[in-house]
């Protein structure tokens, strides 16, 4: 498929222009070479117009031009002075006409409307309102005020002064007489229809002094906005619909065979299953504006996107709209990372996460995405040094491995971490991924003790046993903060017994802390990785406490406590809008709120790695 | 080559404080923990306190509590003990010890050449 | 506190000889299967050198004829065969417990 996109169909009138837009992957080799805008024959082939390199076909001469933008992967190609001969098959193209990439787009220039004089016209979104304005003289001002519609050769009735509504305009429209000082009646029309479009005539009186005025009516059906994304990458659909609809239920509708329009999201909390775990609407400011994200686009989720306002949460005819025709550009630059991660209840995960690699000094961000409502993602770690408060000791956010990718690891896991998560930055807003991470059957690969207590002033000693299929992976000790885990130096003390039907390549490694003081008190994790890239962690809570009596502290799985309890912890939630200090783009539109629900998680924890598109078990 | 380098002997007045300093070199600074030593002329040697430069954690002998404070310097990785109201009995020999903090297998493996404090008027 | 008792509180043994060294605390300083007890010898004007750690493991540069032994209370050094240069004074020190304690020392001479 040609990763070149443009307008499928422009649309225009005689003696207009129109500026088409055309995107392509802004690779070194896209942005220099030749882009072109030829028109297709009946026999094939497509003739050159107009091409960056200089070239004016004399069709176009004086009257067209071609710009280039390298920076933003676009090129627009502008063209004035339209008549009816310009209708037609068009390509814009990147390369030799004939090599396939290229975009087709049909152009339509029809004849302007033969008005009548002294017609005004009003020019109308689909959805909208419109005003139309009918003076009169003295003479009529007690006499009948109506307003027709010419279809064909007749006037049909649209409304009258009397009462009478053409059962077409039912419940939205008016007619308004002013007050005695002025000369006028209005007619409002509401939800505007693409057929309400044509000429009118409001007239007042019905005899031969009776005062006419002509209308024409143009609904435009909005063209829709192109916004070309990469595969794997989000789009923001920003919708302002005007504060007339400020309290009308708003949604997200992406059409499919026909007229159809399939909700993809709305306020009165329908969601596509397609887009579960990976769309956001955001709550709307107080002039009706709302905004949807999308992230982890599919091929699929190419299309015509509308956005409106209706009562019913889904498209109707009068339903105010925008529009956008959304490409999924499969020359993504976004990498392939897994798009699911398993891990087993007391175990941990290990979630690489991609971000743009011109961004190395960006803030990242991994959020829970919650569904309830219409979506939202409170943040649960940045790599500022903020950790939410029931995550602390079970997550951690490491740049490593660097160089386009960070990773998050989560430890001690239980059923509630089932969810979708995304991975983002306060750069580029395009790089939001999400990882769904899904608790299966099994037990945790890593064996440590559970509640450690150490004694002032003594040596702790903490094991961790790693089963045999770990035997070629990096084995680690660190303890955790909320900037990382600082690794620690452990000792490898032979093979473990604490597997069965496993040989000598099982390992036991110890942590060992001489001198324990109050400051050591905390989260550690034993794990694996394979040079910066992290594999499955275990969590122990050391707590430090004076010396009693005397006595031997051996800390073995055998005599290790059950998991920590569960505590329930202050929600330590921040609106997200609170890390946008530094850069106002940063979720401008994904306002999380206050999160009180999430508990402590005091369980231990197991991490995957595997395939692009799936995590599981622990090859790498 | 590891070294613990500690300042100058000090003649000093009672009731006034001083900080020994222990300069290291040769070694990963925040893997060990600093022990400092007093041995008084002729006595026994006794454990004052030990300082993990990785957190700052510290563990005093309760007879050395309120009279000194042990402190580290990272990015110098030197060690550092005040004494504070001294008097004729804080008199000695003052030595710091390293001590590998990650092995149950470790001890106080190498000492610095001691600082000589004298308290008189 | 756990309290170290040295014994002899000096000794005087013949070159060749074998010099034992005795240390007891007033409880266990075992722990994780190790004792926490380490000698030291000290020469005059010089700090301290480690010699034996864990009980029995001899530290670095430390010539074979320093050996340790003992678990629990009771330590012992043994220096076989005894040579001019190890004339000083050894203390034993237990590492299991703060405060760190060390024994009253042994002054060990050439007879």
């Known amino acids: 498929k040609s990763p070149i996109f443009g307008p499928e169909e422009v649309n225009s009138v005689e003696g207009n222009s129109v500026s088409i837009t055309c995107y392509y992957p802004p690779t070194s080799v896209n942005r220099h070479t030749r882009k072109y805008w030829c028109r297709q024959g009946a026999r094939g082939g497509c003739i050159t117009l107009i091409s960056s390199e200089g070239y004016v076909s004399s069709k176009y001469a004086g009257r067209a031009n071609l710009t280039n933008f390298p920076e933003n992967g676009t090129f627009v190609v502008n063209i004035a002075q339209l008549s009816q001969d310009d209708s037609g098959r068009y390509k814009c193209g990147l390369g030799i006409n004939s090599r396939g990439l290229s975009f087709d787009v049909s152009l339509e220039v029809s004849q302007g409307p033969g008005l009548l004089n002294d017609t005004k016209v009003y020019t109308v979104d689909l959805g909208r309102t419109v005003t139309i304005n009918c003076p009169f003289k003295t003479e009529n001002a007690q006499k009948r005020k109506s307003l027709y519609k010419q279809i064909g050769l007749y006037p049909v009735l649209v409304i009258d002064s009397s009462g009478y509504v053409n059962p077409n305009y039912t419940g939205r429209i008016r007619l308004d007489i002013q007050g005695t000082g002025q000369l006028l009646f209005s007619v409002v029309i509401n939800q505007l229809r693409l057929s309400d479009a044509g000429q009118y005539l409001c007239q007042a009186g019905d005899d031969s002094n009776s005062n006419k005025k002509n209308a024409d009516l143009q609904v435009l059906k909005p063209e829709p906005e192109l916004v070309y994304e990469d595969l794997r990458g989000s789009v923001t659909f920003h919708c302002a619909l005007g504060p007339e609809v400020a309290n009308v239920a708003k949604f997200l509708c992406r059409q499919s065979s026909g007229e159809n329009c399939d909700v993809v999201v709305n306020t009165l909390g329908k969601r596509a299953p397609a887009f579960e775990g990976r769309i956001l609407l955001n709550p709307q400011d107080k002039d009706g504006s709302f905004s949807v994200v999308i992230t982890g686009l599919r091929k699929e989720d190419a299309g015509r996107y509308l956005c409106g306002a209706h009562s019913d949460g889904q498209l109707q005819e009068g339903s105010p709209i925008q529009a956008w025709q959304l490409f999924v550009n499969e020359e993504s630059t976004i990498p392939r990372s897994p798009t699911v991660v398993k891990g087993v209840a007391g175990g941990s995960v290990a979630v690489l996460c991609p971000y743009n690699r011109k961004e190395s000094k960006s803030i990242k961000y991994w959020c829970l995405w919650e569904g309830a409502q219409n979506g939202r993602c409170p943040l649960l770690v940045d790599s500022e040094g903020w950790v939410k408060a029931q995550y602390e000791g079970r997550l951690s956010l490491l740049e490593e491995p660097g160089n386009g990718t960070f990773t998050v690891i989560l430890n001690q896991l239980t059923s509630r971490d089932a969810g979708f998560y995304w991975c983002l930055t306060n750069g580029d807003t395009l790089w939001r991924t999400t990882v769904e991470i899904k608790i299966i059957e099994g037990e945790p690969n890593l064996k440590v003790p559970g509640n450690v207590t150490a004694v002032l002033g003594e040596t702790l000693k903490v094991p961790c046993h790693f089963p045999c299929k770990f035997s070629s992976y990096e084995k680690y000790w660190c303890k955790w903060n909320n900037t990382g885990c600082q690794a620690l130096p452990s000792q490898d003390e032979g093979p473990s017994k604490a597997f069965v039907n496993c040989d000598e390549n099982s390992r036991l490694v110890s942590l060992t802390l001489n001198l324990v003081t109050r400051a050591d008190e905390g989260w550690y994790w034993c794990g694996v990785k394979q040079g910066h890239f992290y594999g499955e962690t275990a969590a122990v809570y050391v707590a430090v406490e004076e010396r009693k009596a005397a006595g031997s502290r051996d800390v073995s799985l055998a005599k290790a406590d059950a998991a920590p309890d569960e505590k329930v912890l202050d929600s330590g939630f921040r609106e997200i809008e609170n890390k946008a200090i530094q850069d106002p783009r940063l979720f401008a539109e994904e306002k999380a709120v206050a999160d009180t629900r999430d508990q402590a998680d005091g369980s231990r924890a197991s991490v995957d790695s595997g395939s692009s598109e799936e995590q599981g078990g622990s090859s790498r | 080559e590891v070294q613990l380098q500690q300042s100058g002997p000090d003649l000093v007045k009672p009731g006034a404080s001083v900080k020994i300093s222990c300069k290291t070199s040769?070694?990963?600074?925040?893997?060990?923990?600093m022990h400092w030593v007093k041995q008084s002329h002729g006595k026994s040697l006794e454990w004052i306190g030990g300082?993990?430069?990785?957190?700052?954690?510290?563990s005093y002998n309760q007879k050395f509590k309120g009279k000194a404070t042990l402190t580290v310097d990272k990015s110098s990785t030197t060690a550092y003990m005040e004494l504070r109201g001294l008097t004729s009995e804080d008199s000695a020999v003052y030595s710091c010890?390293?001590?590998?903090?990650?092995?149950?297998?470790?001890?106080?493996?190498?000492w610095g050449q001691g600082t000589t404090l004298t308290v008189s008027s | 506190d756990i309290v170290l008792t040295q014994s002899p509180a000096s000794l005087a043994v013949s070159l060749g000889q074998r010099a034992t060294i005795s240390c007891r605390a007033s409880?266990?300083?075992?722990?994780?299967?190790?004792?926490?007890m380490n000698w030291f010898q000290q020469k005059p004007g010089q700090p301290p050198k480690l010699l034996i750690y864990?009980?029995?493991n001899q530290g670095s540069g430390v010539p074979g004829r320093f050996s340790g032994s003992g678990s629990g209370t009771d330590f012992s050094l043994n220096i076989h065969p005894m040579e001019e240069d190890d004339t000083a004074m050894y203390f034993c020190?237990?590492?299991?417990?703060?405060?760190?304690?060390f024994g009253g020392g042994t002054k060990l001479e050439i007879k």
């Open positions: 010890a390293r001590y590998y903090r990650y092995d149950v297998l470790s001890a106080m493996d190498y």
């Open positions: 409880e266990s300083v075992d722990n994780y299967a190790i004792s926490f």
């Open positions: 864990a009980a029995s």
């Open positions: 020190q237990q590492s299991k417990a703060v405060p760190y304690t």
């Open positions: 040769g070694y990963t600074f925040i893997e060990y923990t």
């Open positions: 300082i993990n430069p990785n957190n700052g954690g510290t």
